[in-house]
Amino acid sequence: KFSKQSWGLENEALIVRCPRQGKPSYTVDWYYSQTNKSIPTQERNRVFASGQLLKFLPAAVADSGIYTCIVRSPTFNRTGYANVTIYKKQSDCNVPDYLMYSTVSGSEKNSKIYCPTIDLYNWTAPLEWFKNCQALQGSRYRAHKSFLVIDNVMTEDAGDYTCKFIHNENGANYSVTATRSFTVKDEQGFSLFPVIGAPAQNEIKEVEIGKNANLTCSACFGKGTQFLAAVLWQLNGTKITDFGEPRIQQEEGQNQSFSNGLACLDMVLRIADVKEEDLLLQYDCLALNLHGLRRHTVRLSRKNPIDHHS
């Protein structure tokens, strides 16, 4: 469960996250499992550890192997394993299966291809996109932040899409490429104004001080693949990332589910070690798509730990 496959190409940057998570204040030690040799943290090294991240700048085929990360806190240690494989660059245009990230699908009205793993890197626009080694050009293709949108998708748009970007580390630039398949579904979908299923409007959630708490923001957006649908949390009207409380984090990525045939998304807000001041905050679940934005507000209240339910 706490082992993760990662792969990359030689002479490209590769950044791997420890499969075990911890607070930013926890120290993370990395080791090369075969030799139990510690990975240095000095950035002058080609391979170095930076907290939860292991950086290969650039990667070499010889770097392949299993790496151990240990998240250390004052009260516990958690161990994870990163199985890293670095491949030689292909001379032809074919991307082998072992270099492919998960397949995504789209339909005539809705198509969005995320660039895999890009969130781990320090990249700046432009993000370049290729299909079968050809740079994508024309008004049908739009690069939005970390994803590609294809307008008026046709069956011919199915294929392997590669994103290419530059990772910057202390002024040095490294190339990164990632490829995933895109399939086109012929479906009669529709899109609705977002409907938030959870939390209930003005919900009061009972939490215990000192314990962890999870809040789930869940909304449905229509039938079929949804274009630019998202759910997220705000704290006192501020994005979680801007609020600056490391104990309170949004889950990475959004989980997609289907409820009665409707396409739904949910985002979990994790509050570690709930404190008194967390009860004073306002938690807003936002659901948005092309039609508009909806929000539901949650507040926390203290749960009496001696409450007994028959």
């Epitope: 939005h144 932040k145 003005n202 630019l228 705000q234 009207g237 501020t238 306002q282 508009g292 909806r294």
Partner: antibody
């Protein structure tokens, strides 16, 4: 100092088109959600349109949906409003306004406005 | 759509008076409410956001309160420069809607 400067207003006939621009300076435009708000002569404020910082999301008031298009060019720090099929009831001062936070529709900075008159 | 209703539509007051303007939303908007001041020929100015947070640079005689559907803007001691029209606005969901405005005139 934050500045928003609208331009492109003027007199146009019903059914005509106009493109408004709003030049922004003094803040990180590419990180800011932006809006257009209008005010008919002697009337109250009416929100017209919204665009997210990355241009991914655009929202419109029902009264302009299908006729107006909001867009932005982050490399030029400029917000646009393309107005087609204009009607007499679109006559108003059009303001561009910055939202004070992503996904918060509180408008903390406004331009001075540009007057659009739709008349034959 | 959420309707915002302000009252009164206009009021006359003297310098030094305590002035209260109310705003009612057609459904609960929690505290997602802003107040703006607008003077003739000028752009609106943000006074209060999140129902009760004072925007930077706004004098402390302005205050906001309320949650849910009923909100109040209070000017504790009216100054000559406060004669203007005031608007409430909900930012709870789209479409964004404003109240019809309250004009504060000199008595």
């Amino acid at each position: 100092e934050v500045q928003l400067l609208e331009s492109g207003g003027g007199l146009v006939q019903p059914g005509g088109s106009l493109r408004l621009s709003c030049a922004a300076s003094g803040f990180t435009f590419s990180n800011s959600d932006m809006n257009w708000v209008r005010q008919a002569p002697g009337k109250g404020l009416e929100w017209v349109s919204f665009i997210s910082s990355s241009s991914g999301y655009t929202y419109y008031a029902d009264s302009v949906k299908g006729r107006f298009t909001i867009s932005r060019d982050n490399s030029k720090n400029t917000l646009y409003l393309q107005m087609n099929s204009l009607r007499a009831e679109d006559t108003a001062v059009y303001y561009c306004a910055r939202a004070n936070n992503n996904w918060n529709f509180y408008f903390d900075y406004w331009g001075q406005g540009t007057l659009v008159t739709v008349s034959s | 759509d959420i309707q915002m209703t302000q009252s009164p539509s206009s009021l006359s007051a003297s310098v030094g008076d305590r002035v209260t303007i109310t705003c009612r939303a057609s459904q609960s908007i929690n505290n997602w409410l802003a107040w703006y001041q607008q003077k003739p020929g000028k752009a609106p100015k943000l006074l209060i956001y999140s129902a009760s947070s004072l925007q930077s640079g706004v004098p402390s005689r302005f205050s906001g309160s309320g949650s849910g559907t009923d909100f109040t803007l209070t000017i504790s001691s009216l100054q000559p420069e406060d004669f203007a029209t005031y608007y409430c606005q909900q930012s709870y969901d789209t479409p964004i809607t404003f109240g019809q405005g309250t004009k504060v005139e000199i008595k």
